[in-house]
Amino acid sequence: SWMWNQFFLLEEYTGSDYQYVGKLHSDQDRGDGSLKYILSGDGAGDLFIINENTGDIQATKRLDREEKPVYILRAQAINRRTGRPVEPESEFIIKIHDINDNEPIFTKEVYTATVPEMSDVGTFVVQVTATDADDPTYGNSAKVVYSILQGQPYFSVESETGIIKTALLNMDRENREQYQVVIQAKDMGGQMGGLSGTTTVNITLTDVNDNPPRFPQSTYQFKTPESSPPGTPIGRIKASDADVGENAEIEYSITDGEGLDMFDVITDQETQEGIITVKKLLDFEKKKVYTLKVEASNPYVEPRFLYLGPFKDSATVRIVVEDVDEPPVFSKLAYILQIREDAQINTTIGSVTAQDPDAARNPVKYSVDRHTDMDRIFNIDSGNGSIFTSKLLDRETLLWHNITVIATEINNPKQSSRVPLYIKVLDVNDNAPEFAEFYETFVCEKAKADQLIQTLHAVDKDDPYSGHQFSFSLAPEAASGSNFTIQDNKDNTAGILTRKNGYNRHEMSTYLLPVVISDNDYPVQSSTGTVTVRVCACDHHGNMQSCHAEALIHPTGLSTGA
């Protein structure tokens, strides 16, 4: 059988000879060299060599336990002549013994950590960890103790755990933000002769809201012209807060003052400034100075710091309204006037008035914007604003005239205002009714008396208030002995009726009927229109076959029946 125990070997051997490990030996070995010892497994033939005759094992290289703590090899004892094993192949272990040749190494070369300012003593900051590659199961080579080399009295470290804690009360970020702490890890339980490593911990105090906003001055003064429209920024105020980020955010509000309704304050989120803006239209002539009380406050407050006082501050803002030379102001935004279309030239239609709103009350002159009255139909009295006609009007040509009147300060022509004038032309009965179309019709030779051969329609350019009422009649000169009659339908239409039985186109091929159309407005207007009637041969249905003259092209749908 094999005769050996577990082999032990000290790491980091520095001798000049190979390091002796031990001897493999079989009790079958007679010592005559008839056996051959063979080594296989971890490092065999390289790290570990065997004298094949004696079984002596040696290590050829310096071994590092931290690289490999255990080597597992196999041994054979074989009869050199036959190759026959005299023992079963067997596994054995070479265990590498530790020496303290590794210093503790921190998991990071540099740690970064944060802790809120004003934290209580003993507040956890960060845990640092150092590992020692030496054997933790043997001696104290890997027993690490932590200590602080730099960073007192602000911070401390727990020797066993590497937990860094705050050690000083009321550490104020606004006073100092960054701390560099150096921690040492030492093996051998911190004893003399132990190996050590260090790491740097960069600790940043994070902000808490322990500072209120403060205005750098108690009073601000701004000027703004009275013409500033609502929303116009007129000045910026800024309170400063020693905190940062959310803790330095400021909200501005107007809390008091006679300008409370006239001005607003908005917070610029980027610059943390309060912007005073115009809320309502200003009027220098009414009020020249306003005072406001503006408050700056932190929206987020930490209750534990309320004992330091209110987290707000206020300042007085004085706003001076500056006078602006304003243009004249018309009494109305627009004027609507009316005039009859038969008005004579120089007829007054109405008037406009404008006043300078400034304290100076500068006199005003009026004029018509000629771009809006190219035909110069209207004029204005430059002194009193009276509008009058300068040409005759015609409602039927243009119902509405839209013109612009300008009011200009006499002392400062640059200051002017404009107002629209809408002038409606009222209707006068100055147009006669007339036929709606040209009428040319026919009558059959065999027509019976009182047959309707044409319906007449009329139109009138006027627009009477109560609507059109037309009357139709034959002209007096044609009324007696006429072959046709006009029947007024009392609905603004009339019919032409035959007056006898039968017509002879050879005797009279064409009749011209003068018809008088009248309206019933004042003054009455009338006109005479002529209707041409041709006599034609018709079939027994009353359809035209031929006329003495050229064939008629009859309007579609016109009834010619008996």
């Epitope: 005559d32 036959t82 094993p85």
Partner: antibody, heavy 117, light 111 residues
Framework: EVQLVQSGAEVKKPGSSVKVSCKAS????????MHWVRQRPGQGLEWMGD????????HYTQKFKDRVTITVDKSTSTAYMELSSLRSEDTAVYYC??????????WGQGTTVTVSS | DIVMTQSPDSLAVSLGERATINCRAS??????????MHWYQQKSGQPPKLLIY???NLESGVPDRFSGSGSETDFTLTISSLQAEDVAVYYC?????????FGGGTKVEIK
């Protein structure tokens, strides 16, 4: 390079003896056993015996035990095989071979011995 | 003596085909997991050449188309893809017990 060089062919009379040499080179002669194997014409291989050059310990097959003698000269790294009382059936090619853990890893070129009256 | 019986006596195989030679020992030649069985190749007019030792270990310089397997009494030499230069007589040999003995040989030829 390991080499085993054998002596030349021999023609012998029945009843006489023959001594074949085998000179080794390219390795430590005393570290390996030297074996002798013969091959009769058209036949297979037949192990005759071996010797440990460091101690001159020998082993012979029963068939040749009385007639074969294997020796070495360590100074010249040469092994010898002497076969006596030759008969016609001893006509064969005789090989020396280096033994390592029961296997023959290097062989001589062979020596032809002819036994004829 | 341990008798080594090889089969077949001769074998004709096509180029590129597998050739398998068997060797049976009259008793076990294995001990402690070591199989004391070795294989040789002998070409015409030349001394034998070691191919496989301890049943399955390929001797240095021998092509890997040769392989050995087996234990106790039954062993096999396999040529996975026969080449023209593999034409030879193949012998098995045991070193388990004196006298060391060889198989009768198997002649391998090209079909």
């Amino acid at each position: 390079e390991v080499q085993l060089v054998q002596s030349g062919a021999e023609v012998k009379k029945p009843g006489s003896s023959v001594k074949v040499s085998c000179k080794a080179s390219g390795y430590t002669f005393t570290n390996y056993w030297m074996h002798w194997v013969r091959q009769r014409p058209g036949q297979g291989l037949e192990w005759m015996g071996d010797i440990d050059p460091s101690h001159s310990e020998t082993h012979y097959t029963q068939k040749f035990k009385d007639r074969v003698t294997i020796t070495v000269d360590k100074s010249t790294s040469t092994a010898y095989m002497e076969l006596s009382s030759l008969r016609s059936e001893d006509t064969a090619v005789y090989y020396c071979a280096r033994g390592d853990l029961g296997r023959f890893d290097y062989w001589g070129q062979g020596t032809t011995v002819t036994v004829s009256s | 003596d341990i008798v080594m019986t090889q089969s077949p006596d001769s074998l004709a195989v096509s180029l590129g085909e597998r050739a398998t030679i068997n060797c049976r020992a009259s008793e076990s030649v294995s001990i402690h997991g070591t199989h004391l069985m070795h294989w040789y190749q002998q070409k015409s007019g030349q001394p034998p050449k070691l191919l496989i030792y301890a049943a399955s270990n390929l001797e240095s310089g021998v092509p890997d188309r040769f392989s050995g397997s087996g234990s106790e009494t039954d062993f096999t030499l396999t040529i996975s893809s026969l080449q023209a230069e593999d034409v030879a007589v193949y012998y098995c040999q045991q070193s388990f017990e004196d006298p060391w003995t060889f198989g009768g040989g198997t002649k391998v030829e090209i079909k």
